[in-house]
Interface confidence: medium
């Protein structure tokens, strides 16, 4: 049960030994109690107990005091849980009875008679302190105290509230006076079942099982998971995502140890959009009001901006957009209304209230719509929160990420290494590369897994100039020149300056 | 589901009148906004007055003084009084109403042909 209702009787005092029907009992009255708890009544009432009911063995003949007793037949106080919501108030009513019978059941005796009733009604706050009271009629008095305490585990002004402390994998906590949790520390969350991470550890690319802890997930490393990892043999660049080598400024090639001028020799940007040589593919382009895209490649409708409001339909014109409003609004962007809240102008379930004598409205919206007339469900994709690709959906009162395959994490953040299984054959290298893995082959392999045995060796010949490394298997001819700093050309035969007339991968 | 009838369009010379009807079949109509739009031939549509359940109105400058919008709940009928019509008010005329921003109804549309 949620908790327990005790009676201590204290003393009883019968001194004529007289029943209430006035006779007297021979040769005294050996007592005992009938107690019965019920909802509160302002006539209390025949009928059942609701709230529970108890019978003592014989206390005592006459006039008794009754003594604590923990256990057994006889105990005192008397106790009667119950497994409800206590509801601060009750009718209590106790009866002492004369038994000619056995002194352990006398409820099974024949022939009881009454001595006295007592009845009280009135409110008990749960709580430690007893309540004494004292009731007197023409032949007895009854000295008792009662008091209301929650059973273990129980807690709160009417013992509604569970709460049993733990230390294991399904929570780490005490109880307070109250019922409330209070984490162990070093754990956190409504049922303290999230341990807190050493302090600064990344929240999404480290984590722990256990407090002050810092696990990094894969790409990532130190002490707070906050570095990520960059490519291995990334020379001149840097990492913002792991396993990314981003090249600095004039750097290019697999391993960022190829000087190139991307701009000058590829002019990627389009609609007379800016080209600078920075960013992770080597250029950024720049563009020019009314285009988007990578290249500045695209040219924005004049209603991306969503332009017209209170659910106006845009229409693009050739320098221009129109606004074609809803009735009840009007102006260029359907900002002006008409409307009061007798149009019922608020939906989704929002609450119109009037503003200036009722000339005008306001809508009051509920969670997860909003805009003047609470038209727009809450798009916690606008932010666009996926990395890499990633789909953003919305869910309800949340949104995931559908991350593009090779990635994943709560973002799609983190990059699952293509690398992981091994792919190239015959000890060669693999490399982790956006669009896949490549493979550099040993000698006498080639294939995109160097899975092809070569009868002659593409790099036997010595095919690369000026001191050039040779990697046979990355090309359909079988060989790859990767040029010391200063050199170009698909051999890294001409010194930088000199544009080479053909592309540098053989 | 509303359905919307656009009736009283014609042929009329320059400086005539006409009136237009709008009837509402399939739901409470005085808790509705109605509006009359109207498209020119290879123009935008475009809002040309419209009328709120208390019967506050509102008019394009373009229509402002000549043109006249009421209803009449009773009959579940929407109006509007075209007076001092000009040939550039020749268009297609549409009534419309909104219950709410996935709900929009449109009537299929009446001929007006102001001729000069």
């Known amino acids: 049960g949620s908790g327990i209702f005790q009676l201590r009787l204290q003393e009883f005092v019968n001194q004529r030994g007289m029943l209430a029907n006035g006779q007297s009992c021979e040769p005294g009255c050996r007592t005992f109690f009938r107690i019965c708890l019920k909802h509160f009544q302002a006539t209390f009432s025949e009928g059942p107990c609701t709230f529970g009911n108890v019978s003592t063995p014989v206390l005592g003949t006459n006039s008794f005091v009754v003594r604590d007793k923990n256990s057994g037949s006889g105990r005192n106080p008397l106790q009667l849980p119950f497994n409800f919501t206590w509801p601060g108030t009750f009718s209590l009513n106790i009866q002492a009875w004369h038994t000619p019978g056995d002194d352990l059941r006398p409820e099974t005796s024949p022939g009881n008679s009454l001595i006295s009733q007592i009845i009280i009604q009135g409110s008990l706050a749960v709580g430690k302190i007893w309540r004494t009271d004292e009731q007197n009629d023409t032949l007895t008095r009854l000295s008792y105290s009662y008091r209301v305490i929650c059973s273990d585990n129980y807690y709160g002004e009417s013992c509604s509230r569970l709460c049993k402390k733990r230390d294991d994998h399904f929570g780490h906590y005490e109880c307070q006076p109250d019922g409330s949790l209070s984490c162990l520390p070093g754990w956190t969350g409504k049922y303290c079942d999230q341990p807190i991470c050493l302090s600064g550890c990344h929240e999404q690319n480290g984590y722990c099982s256990k407090p002050d802890e810092c696990i990094c997930r894969p790409g990532w490393q130190g002490r707070l998971c906050n570095e990520c990892i960059p490519h291995n043999g990334c020379r001149h660049g840097t990492c913002s995502i792991p396993w990314q080598c981003a090249c600095d400024e004039g750097w290019g090639g697999l391993f960022c140890d190829q000087d190139l001028n991307y701009c000058t020799h590829h002019s990627p940007c389009k609609n007379g959009s800016t080209c600078s040589n920075s960013g992770p593919k080597g250029y950024t382009c720049t563009c020019l009001p009314g285009y988007t895209g990578e290249h500045c490649e695209l040219g924005l409708s004049k209603c991306a901006s969503n332009p017209c409001r209170n659910g106006g339909s845009c229409k693009d014109q050739e320098n221009s957009y129109h606004c074609l409003c809803p009735p009840g609004y009007y102006g260029q962007h359907c900002e002006h209304s008409t409307l009061t809240c007798a149009d019922s102008p608020c939906f989704n379930g929002g609450s119109c209230r009037e503003r200036n004598q009722g000339s005008s409205y306001a809508c009051e919206c509920p969670p997860n719509f909003t805009g003047s007339n609470c038209e727009k469900k809450v798009d916690r994709c606008t932010s666009n929160p996926c990395a890499n690709g990633g789909q953003c959906q919305n869910r309800g009162p949340s949104r995931t990420c559908r991350c593009r395959p090779g990635f994943t994490g709560t973002h799609c953040e983190l990059h699952i290494s293509d690398c992981a299984r091994s792919p190239c054959a015959h000890g060669g290298t693999c490399h982790d590369l956006e669009n896949g893995p490549v493979c550099t082959c040993p000698a006498g392999f080639s294939g995109r897994r160097c899975e092809v045995r070569i009868t002659h060796d593409a790099c036997a010949s010595g095919p690369c100039f000026n001191g050039a490394t040779c990697y046979t298997g990355l090309s359909p001819n079988n060989f790859v020149c990767n040029c010391p700093y200063g050199f170009v050309g698909s051999r890294c035969e001409f010194p930088v300056g000199l544009p080479p007339s053909f592309p540098w991968v053989a | 589901e509303v359905q919307l009838v656009e009736s009283g369009g014609g042929l009329v010379q320059a400086g005539g009148s006409l009136r237009l009807s709008c009837a509402a079949a399939g739901s409470t109509f005085s808790s509705y906004v109605m509006g009359w739009y109207r498209q020119a031939p290879g123009k935008q549509r475009e809002l040309v007055a419209h009328?709120?359940?208390?019967?506050?109105?509102y008019y394009a400058d373009s229509v402002k003084g000549r043109f006249t919008i009421s209803r009449d709940n009773a009959k579940n009928t929407m109006y509007l009084q075209m007076n001092s019509l000009k040939p550039e008010d020749t268009a297609v005329y549409y009534c419309?109403?909104?219950?709410?921003?996935?709900?929009?109804?449109w009537g299929q549309g009446t001929q007006v042909t102001v001729s000069s």
């Open positions: 419309n109403t909104r219950r709410n921003f996935l709900s929009n109804y």
């Open positions: 009328i709120s359940t208390r019967g506050i109105t």
